[in-house]
């Protein structure tokens, strides 16, 4: 959580110099962007500074999470009067500086995204030249991923008193609505488990006791699409076999 | 609407620990959170702050005598301050930053006296 | 110095203007939020960044900033604006959060 003081009064006194009043540490970030699955997204934050006309090397990292001590997931660094911000990290190589940090714009691009990439993102600048600082925004802006429903599991297990049961487990933003069909069934939300923390986009849905042989199907379905697949009970002398 | 509901004590011994609670109702616990006490007839002291993540940051002049958590199953938020004094009697509030840097949503605060 | 310096008191006679300041290093790097305290109540944010009004704060309060000073303006004082201001702003070294020490604003007549 260090912010450096600034070194000099100079610098200090020299910003008030122009008509245009100082400027203090600011960070503009939107509180949410939204973004499908498997396209990118761009995350803006411009910010403002008290350091008038600096050209001294500076740095640029965006991480996630967390303020402060999240991880970071970019970061690009700018030789003194230098307008490229050359890439020294990048996870996975899909995060690329859009904005000019020498233009206050830190503004982020994420590639290819996945359920996984919904957090919050901050991006901080610190100067590191003639004058020492740094700045971080403090409440980031929310990436919300969103992505039509995958059936990530589906499976028939044994239960007490030699019955079966089933399970179906899918993802997708909004998390999917689940459904089971199949012999005597007709059209059952069966027990559907809400998403547990820190799997915020996993549904799962319980057929507790499969009564009859046949195809179970489980359909998931969200506004931005539906999926389906089935599992077959054949109960051979007390033998199952499942098959999706 | 986001209210804040503060919940302690009201007395506490001297050399004893102050716990308090902040309730958080209305929207679920997100960024930063404060906690700020006012002594009587004295200004505003900020005690420290922390984020939904569990992050930290603290007044370095009570750091060694304050633990902060977050409860985001239960919406509460929780200060803890060791060692207390007579010095240590004040009204605290819990507050949200939901502002750049400003604190925009207060509780009404809580009495803690410290006295034997 | 890690601190910031308001004016103990301020009187404002009903309807003119008056000017609440805060002084302090850390005013050169970070803008100050303003508070409202009223007894028995919780603060109240007032003003917060460049020139910002939270939702539901009348327009006859601003705010500015010139080096390591900022002021709370009231234009048009009202009876119910009497109360204790509180300028609030990071500290440029650990970032901790600094109060001043509070102004007692007197609405008179």
């Known amino acids: 959580f260090v912010r450096t003081k600034i070194d000099t009064t100079e610098n200090l006194l020299n910003t008030e110099v122009h008509s245009s009043p100082a400027q203090r540490w600011s960070m503009q970030v939107p509180p949410e962007v939204s973004a499908e699955a498997g396209d990118a997204a761009v995350l803006p934050c411009t910010f403002t500074h008290p350091h008038r006309h600096y050209d001294g090397p500076l740095t640029a990292i965006w991480r996630a999470g967390e303020p402060y001590a999240g991880p970071q997931v970019f970061r690009c660094a700018a030789a003194r009067g230098s307008e490229l911000c050359q890439t020294a990290l990048s996870l996975h190589g899909r995060f690329r500086l859009l904005g000019n940090p020498r233009r206050n714009d830190l503004s982020l691009r994420v590639e290819r995204l996945a359920l996984a990439d919904d957090r919050r993102y901050f991006c901080r600048v610190e100067f590191a030249g003639d004058v020492h600082d740094r700045y971080e925004s403090r409440h980031g802006v929310r990436l919300h991923v969103t992505a039509a429903p995958r059936i990530v599991n589906i499976s028939v297990l044994p239960s007490p008193a030699h019955a079966f049961r089933a399970l179906c487990t899918a993802e997708g933003e909004p998390p999917p609505a689940l459904a089971w069909s199949g012999p005597a069934l007709g059209n059952s939300l069966a027990a559907v488990r809400s998403p547990r923390e820190g799997h915020g986009h996993l549904v799962t849905a319980e057929l507790p006791a499969l009564t009859h042989d046949g195809r179970y199907t489980c359909t998931a379905a969200n506004s931005l699409g539906r999926s389906e697949a089935s599992v077959y009970l054949f109960r051979f002398h007390g033998a199952s076999g499942a098959s999706t | 609407q986001v209210q804040l509901q503060e919940s302690g004590p009201g007395l506490v011994n001297p050399s004893g620990t102050l716990s308090l609670s902040c309730t958080v109702s209305g929207d679920s616990i997100r960024n930063w959170y404060s906690w700020v006490r006012q002594p009587p007839g004295k200004g505003l002291e900020w005690i420290g702050e922390?984020?939904?993540?569990?992050?930290?940051n603290h007044n370095p002049s009570l750091k060694s005598r304050v633990t902060m958590s977050v409860g985001k199953s239960t919406s509460q938020l929780s200060l803890i301050l060791n060692s207390v004094t007579a010095a240590d009697t004040a009204v605290y509030h819990c507050?949200?930053?939901?502002?750049?840097?400003?604190?925009?949503?207060w509780g009404p605060g809580t009495m803690v006296t410290v006295s034997s | 110095s890690s601190e910031l310096t308001q004016d103990p008191a301020v009187s404002v006679a009903l309807g003119q203007t008056v000017r609440i300041t805060c002084q302090g290093d850390?005013?050169?790097?970070?803008?100050a939020s303003w508070y409202q305290r009223k007894p028995g109540q919780a603060p109240i944010l007032v003003m917060y960044?460049?020139?910002n009004r939270p939702s539901g704060i009348p327009d006859r309060f601003s705010g500015s900033n010139s080096r390591n000073t900022a002021s709370l303006t009231i234009t048009g004082a009202q009876a119910e604006d009497e109360a204790d201001y509180y300028c609030g702003s990071r500290d440029t070294s650990d970032y901790r959060v600094l109060f001043g020490g509070g102004t007692k604003l007197t609405v008179l007549g």
């Open positions: 922390i984020h939904d993540n569990g992050g930290t």
């Open positions: 850390s005013l050169r790097s970070y803008y």
């Open positions: 507050a949200r930053e939901g502002l750049p840097d400003g604190l925009d949503i």
């Open positions: 960044g460049q020139n």
